[in-house]
Interface confidence: low
């Protein structure tokens, strides 16, 4: 049975040309997790392998960074970026847990990050 | 040009160990993950795990794990899966094959087939 | 671990003919679908990556498709050098599974 949940950072937004921290907790559960994938509408971006380490797709190997955590850090951000992101954690045994994230790139100054929100 | 040589067939004993080795070349050896696959006659392929050559670390499929072990030689860029406790189902053609970022197998070795019978 | 069912185990056609391949995933894959053709004695060979990249030096007639729970295999103009033994793998998470084949014979 399935008992974890995934805290994100939910509703983000940030300044073009800016960086940003995408994140995902997974609680509430004793499962191993195996590997993250991260990924943007069906893109992979970067994989985190418990044993592997970080591996960035090389496409995105110049604006995203490893971290923090099993985090990643999006680079000089353009308004392109704005769209939804996806943490997949692989645990064993339960499964596969996914987390979404909503970015926005804004032009502006008046970026702000939005609150944290649980997916069951 | 990548390249991936394989050892030669080998005949083994129930109960027995078997190493098989994999040399890459036309390529930096530490830049790749390098996988071992397997297949049993006429069946489909399975996973056994990977090795990253760069800092040594390994990720099995867990119903290998305990039976296989899987090391790298950087110096003369071979990597080696060795079974351990093999038993007739094991008997199979075994594949070394490498990975870049995303988890397919873009090259593979000739394979190696491994009997094993008594 | 992720289940792969392929679908047919084997077909028969002839050259000149469109054949599609049917992957189905136990779980959402998104689009983390790999495509590979192993002939008789041969090592696989990668076809397709990402469900419907198609590596490097791999005939325009052969298209993959799909993303989530169902994928194809499509070659839009069988040749003779097409007949072989077709593998579906996720690579999604570890551990990366197989699919059981489909072999494509000569009718």
């Known amino acids: 049975m399935m008992t974890g949940t995934i805290e994100t950072t939910g509703n983000i937004s940030a300044e073009k040309g800016g960086s940003i921290i995408l994140q995902c907790h997974l609680s509430s559960t004793t499962a191993q997790v195996t590997q993250v994938n991260w990924e943007q509408q069906d893109q992979l971006l970067a994989i985190c392998n418990a044993d592997l380490g970080w591996h960035i797709s090389p496409s995105f190997k110049d604006r995203v960074a490893p971290g923090p955590g099993l985090g990643l850090t999006l680079q000089s951000l353009t308004v392109n970026d704005t769209g939804e992101y996806f943490c997949i954690y692989h645990t064993y045994p339960d499964g596969t847990y996914t987390g979404r994230i909503f970015l926005e790139v804004l032009e502006s100054s008046v970026a702000e990050h939005g609150a944290r929100f649980q997916i069951p | 040009q990548l390249q991936l040589v394989q050892s030669g067939a080998e005949v083994k004993k129930p109960g027995a160990s078997v190493k098989v080795s994999c040399k890459a070349s036309g390529y930096s050896f530490t830049d790749y993950n390098m996988n071992w696959v397997r297949q049993a006659p006429g069946q489909s392929l399975e996973w056994i795990g990977v090795i990253n050559p760069n800092h040594g670390t390994i990720s099995y499929n867990q119903k290998f794990k305990g039976r296989v072990t899987m090391t790298r030689d950087q110096s003369t860029s071979t990597a080696y899966m060795e079974l351990n406790s093999l038993r007739s189902e094991d008997t199979a053609v075994y594949y070394c094959?490498?990975?870049?970022?995303?988890?397919?197998?873009?090259?593979w070795g000739q394979g190696t087939l491994v009997t094993v019978s008594s | 671990d992720i289940q792969m069912t392929q679908s047919p185990s084997s077909l028969s056609a002839s050259v000149g003919d469109r054949v599609t391949i049917t992957c189905r995933p136990s779980?959402?894959?998104?689009?983390?679908l790999a495509w590979y053709q192993q002939k008789p004695g041969n090592s696989p060979k990668l076809l397709v990556y990402?469900?419907?990249a198609l590596a490097e030096g791999v005939p325009s007639r052969f298209s993959g498709s799909g993303s989530g729970t169902q994928f194809t295999l499509t070659i839009s103009s069988l040749q003779p050098e097409d007949f072989a033994t077709y593998y579906c793998?996720?690579?999604?998470?570890?551990?990366?599974?197989f699919g059981g084949g489909t072999k494509v014979e000569i009718k």
């Open positions: 793998q996720h690579h999604f998470g570890a551990p990366w599974t």
């Open positions: 990402n469900a419907k």
């Open positions: 094959a490498n990975n870049w970022d995303v988890w397919y197998f873009d090259v």
């Open positions: 779980e959402n894959i998104y689009s983390y």
